[in-house]
């Protein structure tokens, strides 16, 4: 199962859920769907609330219980590293595979931080990150910020991934702009 | 009580097909994830294939990949396994399981020439 | 290609007790507390016997017992009966490989 990492702020704007969390307990499978079920302790959520409902506790995240049909595998045992969890919500229940968005908080950038806490959500209804993955590459919409990060780099862990945002300057256009200028 | 009936072995040509089916009865078929697992003659014990309760997720062990397709059908209690470019090392006793808890008697596959 | 490793034969007395242990990694006995052992006599299906780790189902006589130290998982009979003469598999689950089984042990009881 192979997938590209997309940027922060796509992640966050395609998933019905965003959290941070710590994973703790040892993962079960259920034996009816074959999907994996990592027990978590949530912290924060970013995104979702709505969605939930009442149901504002997420107390486990399912994945399916096997790698190469996209599970996703929690590879550390420290209980209280805090994680950003970006996934899925299917009857309730939030979902996660390799491709998702998983990762600890403190390896993301302060900008990443800022991003999730308040400022991706601006450039969700109007603005499309759009990977540049071979050139020549050329904006499709005004709305559209060319994300280059794996083509210069060859890495998601990019100047755009890591330190800015598409968002709107204006009716119909978006552009790049700086999480560090965002600071309220 | 639990009883799964394997069907559907035989002798075929290497590059060949075969379609097994195992027919379930005493639980809620739908409420389990089954897998068929086959035993070479004189070996052990290797898991080939399984499928969740809905028929969604689908897992398949390297070896047969590509070749092998699982499915069920929850509204006739059955499971199945089709074979496709059968080879000589296909060559087994294949079982169907309920989840692990529960095992058919088995039915040969024999891939010759 | 067997992922867990078991010994290829073992025996013992009736009456006596015996140990039959399945090694794998990280990755799959020592990670999650799946690991299952099944009995197989000649021209038979396998029976379930222990699942996760240490439980027996009902009808498995308590004379069957499992454990699990890191990546080493047992199964003891003890009490050795003349029907217990079989092949014994370990069976455990892993990520990548879903259920990856042991190479069996053909257990012996002497006369």
């Known amino acids: 199962c192979t997938c590209v990492p997309p940027h922060p702020q796509t992640a966050f704007c395609n998933s019905d859920l965003v959290i941070r969390a710590k994973f703790v307990g040892t993962p079960e499978v259920n034996q009816t769907t074959l999907y994996q079920r990592y027990e978590i302790k949530m912290t924060k959520m970013y995104k979702g609330f709505q969605a939930l409902g009442d149901a504002a506790d997420i107390r486990f995240v399912y994945t399916p219980a096997m790698e190469s049909v996209c599970g996703y595998f929690h590879r550390s045992h420290n209980r209280s590293e805090e994680f950003l969890i970006a996934g899925k919500l299917q009857d309730g229940l939030l979902h996660i595979t390799t491709c998702s968005f998983v990762a600890p908080w403190n390896s993301l950038s302060l900008a990443q931080r800022r991003g999730f806490t308040k400022t991706y959500t601006v450039g969700c209804e109007e603005c499309t990150v759009f990977p540049c993955l071979s050139i020549p590459c050329k904006l499709q919409s005004g709305t559209h910020c060319l994300w280059t990060d794996q083509l210069l780099q060859g890495s998601e862990k990019g100047f755009q991934s890591r330190h800015l945002a598409c968002l709107p300057r204006e009716p119909g256009l978006c552009t790049w702009q700086s999480l560090r200028s965002q600071i309220a | 009580q639990v009883q799964l009936v394997e069907s559907g072995g035989g002798l075929v040509q290497p590059g060949g097909s075969l379609r097994l089916s195992c027919a379930a009865s005493?639980?809620?078929?739908?409420?389990?994830?089954m897998s068929w697992v086959r035993q070479a003659p004189g070996k052990g014990l290797e898991w080939v294939s399984g499928i969740s309760g809905n028929g969604v997720l689908i897992f398949y062990a390297d070896s047969v990949k590509g070749r092998f397709t699982i499915s069920r059908d929850n509204s006739k209690n059955t499971l199945y396994l089709q074979m496709n470019s059968l080879r000589a090392e296909d060559t087994a006793v294949y079982y169907c399981a309920r989840w692990f808890d529960h095992w058919g008697q088995g039915t040969l596959v024999t891939v010759s020439s | 290609d067997i992922a867990l490793t078991q010994p290829a034969s073992v025996s013992g007395s009736p009456g006596q007790s015996i140990t039959i242990s399945c090694t794998g990694t990280?990755?799959?006995?020592?990670?999650?507390?799946?690991v299952s052992w099944y009995q197989q006599h000649p021209g038979k299906a396998p029976k379930l016997m222990i699942y996760d780790v240490s439980n027996r189902p009902s009808g498995v006589s308590n004379r069957f017992s499992g454990s699990k130290s890191g990546n080493t998982a047992s199964l003891t009979i003890s009490g050795l009966q003349a029907e217990d003469e079989a092949d014994y598999y370990c069976q455990s689950y892993d990520f990548v490989r879903f259920m990856v089984f042991g190479g069996g042990t053909k257990l012996t009881v002497l006369g």
């Open positions: 005493g639980f809620t078929f739908s409420s389990y994830a």
């Open positions: 990280s990755s799959d006995v020592g990670g999650y507390n799946y």
